[in-house]
């Protein structure tokens, strides 16, 4: 960066090189160039010469003043006009940063995704700080009183093998940057209560042409958890509001859920599960699309689904007798 240049003098910032966004700041430049009494001193920000709010303080020093500085980062340098020198002479440079102290981290959440071998902790960091902000996650065993600390810039994955202090822990997060430090409330967890079952996936759908046509959604999960509660939500792609069905599920076999839907309508389905009675849900599964036939039976397979929503990509549906193409970009 600009800070690595060889200096013939120095440049400094008041109140500091990293300061609160919106502050008034002064940048000073002091020349110490051999055989040069600078006629003029100049400031540059990101390579552009500044023309206002500059004043010479004395023989060797000048000041640049900014009111309400709002740029997160800027590279500053200053130069001198030396008598009998054709070009300006570089004095020094400095990278400056503005931002905010961290907010108090809140909504601290720790979960263990089944089979991951990790406890994943996340939190709401609050407003953007614009400057380098580090987070220290504290994990303290309520049984052994032993505390471990993990440094990160966002979320953290902690190996469950390292959680040797029993099942009950306190977790809290400290946020710190050059402008301040804040600490979250403590979250009490029990390792058995924060497991999220292995992802539930919708594999296919078929509409059976009975007296009243019904659609069967096939879905499954690799979870080994015995008591699992799930929700499936569905809607016509043109609708805004979801319909939700609840299930108590045993994943020893593929699940089949029946729906009585309107004919010749494109529907979207999603599923999520949690260990029964626990706090945390899986995220909703990928969108699964199925268009009900006018009257003819139809099967839609997972193989013809895409995971992107509103991407404008094409979804293929298997119908009896021919292959149809539907645009995916029309869900409400």
């Amino acid at each position: 960066g600009i800070t690595n240049i060889n200096c013939s003098g120095h440049i400094w910032v008041e109140p500091a090189t990293i300061f609160k966004m919106g502050m008034n700041i002064s940048i000073y430049c002091q020349a110490a160039i051999k055989n040069c009494q600078p006629r003029k001193l100049h400031f540059y920000k990101n390579g552009i010469k500044e023309r206002f709010q500059i004043t010479r303080i004395n023989k060797t020093t000048a000041r640049l003043w900014y009111k309400n500085f709002l740029e997160p980062h800027a590279s500053m340098y200053c130069t001198a006009e030396c008598p009998k020198h054709f070009q300006e002479t570089l004095i020094c440079g400095k990278d400056i940063s503005s931002g905010y102290p961290p907010d108090i981290p809140d909504e601290v959440t720790c979960v263990i995704y089944e089979y991951s071998g990790n406890m994943t902790c996340t939190w709401n960091a609050g407003k953007l700080t614009y400057i380098d902000t580090k987070y220290v996650v504290h994990v303290k065993s309520l049984e052994t009183e032993e505390e471990q600390q993990y440094l990160t810039s966002s979320y953290i994955n902690i190996s469950t093998d390292s959680l040797q202090g029993g099942k009950k822990y306190l977790v809290w997060v400290q946020a710190a940057n050059a402008l301040g430090m804040e600490e979250s409330k403590q979250l009490q967890i029990h390792l058995d209560d924060i497991v999220i079952p292995s992802a539930a996936v919708i594999s296919r759908a078929e509409t059976i042409n009975a007296t009243v046509p019904k659609t069967i959604i096939y879905w499954d999960s690799q979870t080994t958890i015995e008591k699992v509660s799930c929700e499936m939500r569905y809607k016509a792609t043109t609708n805004q509001t979801w319909n939700v069905k609840e299930f108590d599920t045993n994943f020893t076999y593929v699940q089949q859920s029946e729906f009585y839907l309107e004919p010749n309508i494109k529907y979207v389905f999603q599923v999520r599960c949690q260990e029964t009675g626990k706090r945390y849900w899986q995220p909703w599964s990928s969108l699964f699309f199925h268009k009900t036939p006018e009257t003819v039976p139809q099967v839609t397979s997972k193989a013809f689904q895409h995971d992107t929503w509103n991407s404008g990509l094409t979804v293929a549906s298997i119908s009896t007798g021919h292959l149809t193409s539907d645009n995916r970009g029309d869900i409400g």
Partner: nanobody, 128 residues
């Protein structure tokens, strides 16, 4: 931005004295060097003298050394040019100029290109 207003110009006889004033207003904290320039009829603008606000260092053109003296009154935001032993060749419109970044060292002869703010000038005529 600073505003500069000159006064004190007059018709005088050779050998007489005159004091010109330059009042600086506006954002007076932003200027550093104040210079005096003159422009005789049919000629280019010529640097006469300058002074630094920070330390009072002064500089003069060779043609006026020993006859003219520049000074400042910080409290009044005014710069003066005391002109003694005036000659007919001193006849010109005298203007003051300011610059926030310029440092007038003792060996410096004021250059028009070094100054960014200008007054409108005051007429000095030396004639018998």
């Amino acid at each position: 931005e600073v505003q500069l207003v000159e006064s004190g110009g007059a018709l005088v006889q050779p050998g007489e004295s005159l004091r010109l004033s330059c009042v600086v207003s506006g954002d007076t904290s932003t200027y550093h060097a104040i210079g005096w320039f003159r422009q005789a009829p049919g000629k280019g603008r010529e640097g006469v003298s300058c002074i630094n606000r920070s330390d009072g260092t002064t500089a003069y053109a060779d043609s006026v050394k020993g006859r003219f003296t520049i000074s400042r009154d910080k409290a009044k935001n005014t710069v003066y040019l005391q002109m003694n032993a005036l000659r007919p060749e001193d006849t010109a419109v005298y203007s003051c100029a300011a610059d926030p970044m310029l440092y007038c060292d003792t060996d410096y002869e004021p250059q028009t290109t070094d100054f960014t703010s200008w007054g409108r000038g005051t007429q000095v005529t030396v004639s018998s």
